[in-house]
Interface confidence: medium
Amino acid sequence: WELTILHTNDVHSRLEQTSEDSSKCVNASRCMGGVARLFTKVQQIRRAEPNVLLLDAGDQYQGTIWFTVYKGAEVAHFMNALRYDAMALGNHEFDNGVEGLIEPLLKEAKFPILSANIKAKGPLASQISGLYLPYKVLPVGDEVVGIVGYTSKETPFLSNPGTNLVFEDEITALQPEVDKLKTLNVNKIIALGHSGFETDKLIAQKVRGVDVVVGGHSNTFLYTGNPPSKEVPAGKYPFIVTSDDGRKVPVVQAYAFGKYLGYLKIEFDERGNVISSHGNPILLNSSIPEDPSIKADINKWRIKLDNYSTQELGKTIVYLDGSSQSCRFRECNMGNLICDAMINNNLRHADEMFWNHVSMCILNGGGIRSPIDERNNGTITWENLAAVLPFGGTFDLVQLKGSTLKKAFEHSVHRYGQSTGEFLQVGGIHVVYDLSRKPGDRVVKLDVLCTKCRVPSYDPLKMDEIYKVILPNFLANGGDGFQMIKDELLRHDSGDQDINVVSTYISKMKVIYPAVEGRIK
């Protein structure tokens, strides 16, 4: 019996087609992805093949103005339209709190939403009961397939799930649910979830009874043969893990942003054992037409976005200096504003020991593309912010050793004075440079804001200590020559859309007046 698994992950509100790098589509003939194109390909496969499941491994939420405006209603609407069979909860599904998950998505989805390792407690338990499930048995042709879900246990550090959801260890939580499916005579089981490729592989190895793992979170691109676009494969598709009980378990992921549709064919024997597995992600490029029905609906929903982008978010009473003449040479108040917003967006998980789990921000000055003039009545709009941050990136959470941070700050000024983009703007950091010294030895003082303290203060950076830092995904991926971050980071979790982070902060503060205050000397 053959099953076709179509899968997406980390779509991050790319409902419209995008450019090849998943930013805003400029030249339509070279654009990719989007739900209208995805629908065309999915329907083509559904017509051609008998047993098809369309699955999503989480993080539909967060990433473009679509999510900012529609807050998840767009996810439910268009996933319903594409007739997804099941979805696993990702960490970003909690970005607007539990209510922001329940109302727009859990109550509106026409497909099961899954996570076995999230347990509700207190008053939330009855409110959320039945709205998401640990597993679902889906009829496919004449057979049934069990889908069991999981979500990153780091979600409380990455999003806003509140205090009434407990995120258990994935493997510990999955095993009893898989065992339950086995007792129901379900002998074909897919683990669908959002914890990253390393955890996906562990689940394949450790959870008895899981036949296939469909993952997300790490934006992993797997491919067999010559890759069709710019993404470099992290391994073959499917990636085969030998389980502790000796089975060959295929593990798949489909990069991110709806650029690819994962396509995996699994052959099962009559006892539900995987006999063979093969496939590849399908690049959703312009050779695949956009479905006109879905496209028309997208255009209808778009109208509200255009109206939103010109509305006032808040006011500034000072000039927001985002000029390259400032931000690539010295501390600029636009850099300070953005870094303050990035830290504010990550205020969560305080306890008796820690006032917050992260206090530091770094931001390449070259990523700040425009100033905002306060003389326009002080008004700040989404449109203004899109000019400052036009690349559609995210502000991510990484863990780095102090020694890596020191290298990053040396790189920041290694060719100072040439108006290059690597000059770092900061938050929760005081850095002093001596530019008379030779490149690679110019950082003379580097103090960082403590987190394990009741009164935050600046302490000298410790080379062997591990620090959490918020930074643009561009830097996490080694952009602007920050190869040491990419090579030496100990953990990387994708965060929220950059413009959304700053716009939320400005809306919260209502009036802003960021200063140049001696963070960089």
């Epitope: 629908f39 009829p139 006109p292």
Partner: antibody
Framework: QVQLQESGPGLVKPSETLSLTCTVS????????WSWIRQPPGKGLEWIGY???????NYNPSLKSRVTISVDTSKNQFSLKLSSVTAADTAVYYC???????????????WGQGTLVTVSS | DIQMTQSPSSVSASVGDRVTITCRAS??????LAWYQQKPGKAPKLLIY???SLQSGVPSRFSGSGSGTDFTLTISSLQPEDFATYYC?????????FGGGTKVEIK
């Protein structure tokens, strides 16, 4: 191949409740929208309402106060109840699934063969 | 509710004829229109969806066109099995509504 079969009494007295069941075979009821549509003798088609396999419903406003559609996933069946019937409710009643080609329950395929319900004392 | 008006209400034609049926919506429905064929004592059968897409298994002599408020079903060369009543149906908004039907009879 999905097949639909309506069943229920062919004669209902005025002011009583008309009850019909549609049994779905060859496919799951949970993943689709399922509609009831009726056709008075010699007349056109009227959409009554739908239920999604997970339970959400949508009814024609002209009948909303009298209609209840429910689903029993364990039996792969969905049902129609129309209360306070009059002679004007005499019709062939069809159950139908949304077409697989339809992203939004826009059109109907397949249909059941229909069952004639006469309202008369 | 969106009203769907079909014309003509009946048409007499011979085998091999080209037959055109029109359907007008009381407000714009984009391409959210389907055409059905119904034979006496039988359930309707989906022919065309999304205004112009041919349902699988339907002969290519059936075609649909139009957008907005005005739509057309064309049978390019009428066959004996095509004598039936044809209905249009809008799928743009709820409640779903059907046209009054067009009966295609033998001349």
């Amino acid at each position: 191949q999905v097949q639909l079969q309506e069943s229920g009494p062919g004669l209902v007295k005025p002011s009583e409740t008309l009850s019909l069941t549609c049994t779905v075979s060859g496919g799951s009821i949970e993943r689709y929208y399922w509609s009831w549509i009726r056709q008075p003798p010699g007349k056109g088609l009227e959409w009554i309402g739908y239920i999604y396999g997970r339970g959400s419903t949508n009814y024609n406003p002209s009948l909303k106060s009298r209609v209840t559609i429910s689903v029993d996933t364990s039996k792969n069946q969905f049902s129609l109840k129309l209360s306070s019937v009059t002679a004007a409710d005499t019709a062939v009643y069809y159950c139908a699934r949304e077409s697989q080609e339809s992203p939004y329950n826009n059109w109907f395929d397949p249909w059941g063969q229909g069952t004639l319900v006469t309202v008369s004392s | 509710d969106i009203q769907m008006t079909q014309s003509p209400s009946s048409v007499s034609a011979s085998v091999g004829d080209r037959v055109t049926i029109t359907c007008r919506a009381s407000q714009g429905i984009s391409s959210w229109l389907a055409w059905y064929q119904q034979k006496p004592g039988k359930a309707p059968k989906l022919l065309i969806y999304a205004a112009s897409s041919l349902q699988s298994g339907v002969p290519s002599r059936f075609s649909g066109s139009g957008s907005g408020t005005d739509f057309t079903l064309t049978i390019s060369s009428l066959q004996p099995e095509d004598f039936a009543t044809y209905y249009c149906q809008q799928g743009n908004s709820f409640p779903r509504t059907f046209g009054g039907g067009t009966k295609v009879e033998i001349k």
